[in-house]
Interface confidence: low
């Protein structure tokens, strides 16, 4: 094939090489940009800035190499449109720094920055961490800061992300109240801050106020749905981003639901309880307090992180006819109480029989290895057994 006379020439099926001296000063309008997976640029001393618009349309780009060029600045959002980028080689340019935001959101397997006149400052603390943690092939490059020695030796004691403190009301919050939250931001070189409220949906009307270093947030006419929802304050500086999430506890009375008993390994009387603060629970059996034991006990399911409702079971291990009856769950918190009842029948009473019928009776033998004198259940020995419960 004849040599390619253009500034950029195809390389393989989806690559482009731009190596003609000084032919580029930006990456706009590269041929076949939308299908490129590899872009190699060299000897472009006029290419000094890399910005968001330069890489627009390069959505398939995996490998980007800009070497021995004049690159002085890479915008923090430069790679927003190249989420698949996995290899980035910017060696032997004029870069003094590179923001942590530039690589945020990318899954870079390789980041090459050797041969740049890097300036050691807190803005490169993220890169120092990459070196410490062996990421992106950075340790092998033994990066130096221009006139300052190895990046690894850069003092970093003062290089912290912002410190956030979110003040929430001490007093109880009731449905319908207005709540003021304040986020105090401390730290060096603060750049941006704000609130993340994606979980709130219809939980309250939101009004933001103030700016750095003190951000205000009013949640008006709160509902009980606000419970367990994260309200997040975030702030960024040249070192990185910090986020602090808080939750507002909105008080509301206890409520309870009971469902029909189901056999799930053991029997389960499913229930749901709600309320803030979380209600205390008490079971009644046929109107009397049910004392929980290892064979009849309350078991909660893993709570969902973003809701106050708790689901669970009254677990009954091998219940018999003596456990048949009326089960009541009482739930109470300082704002109210609730109860629900359900009839459960686990087994027919074997003693309610027609005198004419034969009586199939079996008792499990005592296990001689047992340390207690209690009968030990033997499964599948007989199709039917009578248990005698002594209360």
């Amino acid at each position: 094939a004849a040599p390619c006379p253009d500034a950029c020439c195809p390389h393989g099926s989806s690559g482009l090489r731009c190596t003609r001296d000084g032919a580029l000063d930006s990456l706009h309008h590269l041929p076949g940009a939308e299908n490129l997976t590899e872009l190699y640029i060299e000897n472009q001393q006029h290419l000094q800035h890399l910005e968001l618009r330069d890489l627009r349309g390069l959505g398939e780009l995996r490998n980007l190499t800009i070497v021995k060029s004049g690159l002085r600045f890479v915008a923090p959002d430069a790679f927003h449109f190249t989420p698949r980028l996995s290899r980035l080689n910017l060696s032997f340019n004029a870069l003094e720094s590179l923001s942590w935001k530039t690589v945020q959101g990318l899954s870079l397997q390789e980041l090459v920055l050797s041969g740049n006149p890097l300036h050691c400052s807190c803005a490169l603390r993220w890169l120092q961490r990459w070196e410490e943690e062996g990421l992106g092939g950075v340790p092998e490059q033994k990066l130096q800061c221009h006139g300052q020695g190895p990046l690894a030796h850069m003092p970093n004691a003062s290089c912290g992300v912002p410190t956030l403190k979110v003040q929430v009301p001490n007093a109880s919050v009731d449905v319908g109240d207005d709540v003021l939250l304040r986020c105090q931001v401390e730290g060096r070189g603060l750049e941006q801050a704000g609130w993340i409220l994606t979980e709130l949906e219809q939980s309250a009307t939101v009004m933001k106020s103030g700016g750095l270093p003190s951000l205000g947030l009013t949640l008006a006419n709160v509902t009980s749905d606000l419970n367990r929802k994260n309200v997040t304050c975030w702030a960024e500086n040249d070192v990185g981003r910090a986020e602090v999430s808080v939750q507002v506890n909105v008080s509301f009375p206890a409520s309870v639901q009971l469902h029909t008993a189901v056999e799930m390994h053991h029997w389960c009387i499913p229930f749901s309880v709600d309320g803030q603060p979380a209600p205390s629970l008490r079971w009644l059996f046929n109107g009397s307090v049910l004392n929980e034991t290892s064979f009849i006990f309350t078991e909660f399911l893993e709570p969902a992180a973003n809701e106050t409702v708790r689901h669970g079971c009254l677990r009954l291990n091998q219940p018999t006819h003596v456990n048949n009856g009326n089960y009541t769950l009482l739930a109470a918190n300082p704002f109210g109480q609730a109860s629900a009842s359900i009839m459960a029948a686990f087994m027919d009473n074997p003693f309610e029989f027609n005198p004419e019928d034969p009586i199939p009776v079996s008792f499990s033998p005592v296990d001689t290895n047992s340390t207690s004198g209690d009968p030990v259940e033997k499964k599948d020995e007989t199709p039917f057994g009578v248990s005698v419960a002594v209360g």
Epitope: E132, E133, G134, H153, P155, A157, S158, C159, G160, V161
Partner: antibody, heavy 117, light 106 residues
Framework: QVQLVQSGAEVKKPGASVKVSCKSS????????MHWVRQAPGQGLEWMGE????????NYNEKFKNRVTMTVDISISTAYMELSRLRSDDTAVYYC??????????WGQGTTVTVSS | DVQLTQSPSSLSASVGDRVTITCSAS?????MHWYQQKPGKAPKRLIY???KLASGVPSRFSGSGSGTDYTLTISSLQPEDFATYFC?????????FGQGTRLEIK
């Protein structure tokens, strides 16, 4: 709450090695550097080195570089410091201390190592 | 290595006194950190980043300084403040401590 619990006192002969452990709880072990600092009787504090559990990276004080080995076992959130070729002037209390953004926020209770023939 | 020299090495003072301990570095350090140690106990972080009080530290303690010269001040000595104080730099490897200042009851 954060706790760094160190292994018990040791008595060693000159030329032997000692391995001190520091078990962490109450925080994400891998997110914090672990330092080792020693203090000879009636003396000041001497930094021996540090290790970052996330990467296994270590920095040693040159003074100890050929005799000290710092390791971690992430599965049990424990850091170790082994000092070899012990001399009588290695008799000291050895401390572990953790740091993240600020220096040595929390310290172990110390492990006394006595080197005596 | 960055040498840290504390002065005085020991100091006698009375409850209620204002006490100042200085720490001089052999070369410039970005920040200084201070620890308090009582006999038989591990050091406890007192002040970090030159002037920030560690959690739970009373406001009578303060720190200041820059470059090579740093100061720890106790505005009004309390009985529980009699201890040994160390400065520490976290700006270059190896991390180094001052030799300590022993604060005794007069």
């Amino acid at each position: 709450q954060v706790q760094l619990v160190q292994s018990g006192a040791e008595v060693k002969k000159p030329g032997a090695s000692v391995k001190v452990s520091c078990k962490s709880s109450g925080y994400t072990f891998t997110n914090y550097w672990m330092h080792w600092v020693r203090q000879a009787p009636g003396q000041g504090l001497e930094w021996m080195g540090e290790i970052y559990p996330n990467s296994g990276r270590v920095n040693y004080n040159e003074k100890f570089k050929n005799r000290v080995t710092m390791t971690v076992d992430i599965s049990i959130s424990t850091a170790y410091m082994e000092l070899s070729r012990l001399r009588s002037d290695d008799t000291a209390v050895y401390y572990c201390a953790r740091s993240r953004y600020d220096p040595m926020e929390d310290w172990g209770q110390g492990t006394t190592v006595t080197v005596s023939s | 290595d960055v040498q840290l020299t504390q002065s005085p090495s020991s100091l006698s003072a009375s409850v209620g006194d204002r006490v100042t301990i200085t720490c001089s570095a052999s070369s410039s350090v970005g920040y200084m950190h201070w620890y308090q140690q009582k006999p038989g106990k591990a050091p406890k972080r007192l002040i970090y980043d030159t002037s920030k009080l560690a959690s739970g530290v009373p406001s009578r303690f303060s720190g200041s300084g820059s470059g090579t010269d740093y100061t720890l001040t106790i505005s009004s000595l309390q009985p529980e403040d009699f201890a040994t104080y160390f400065c520490q730099q976290w700006s270059s490897i190896p991390l180094t401590f001052g030799q300590g200042t022993r604060l005794e009851i007069k």
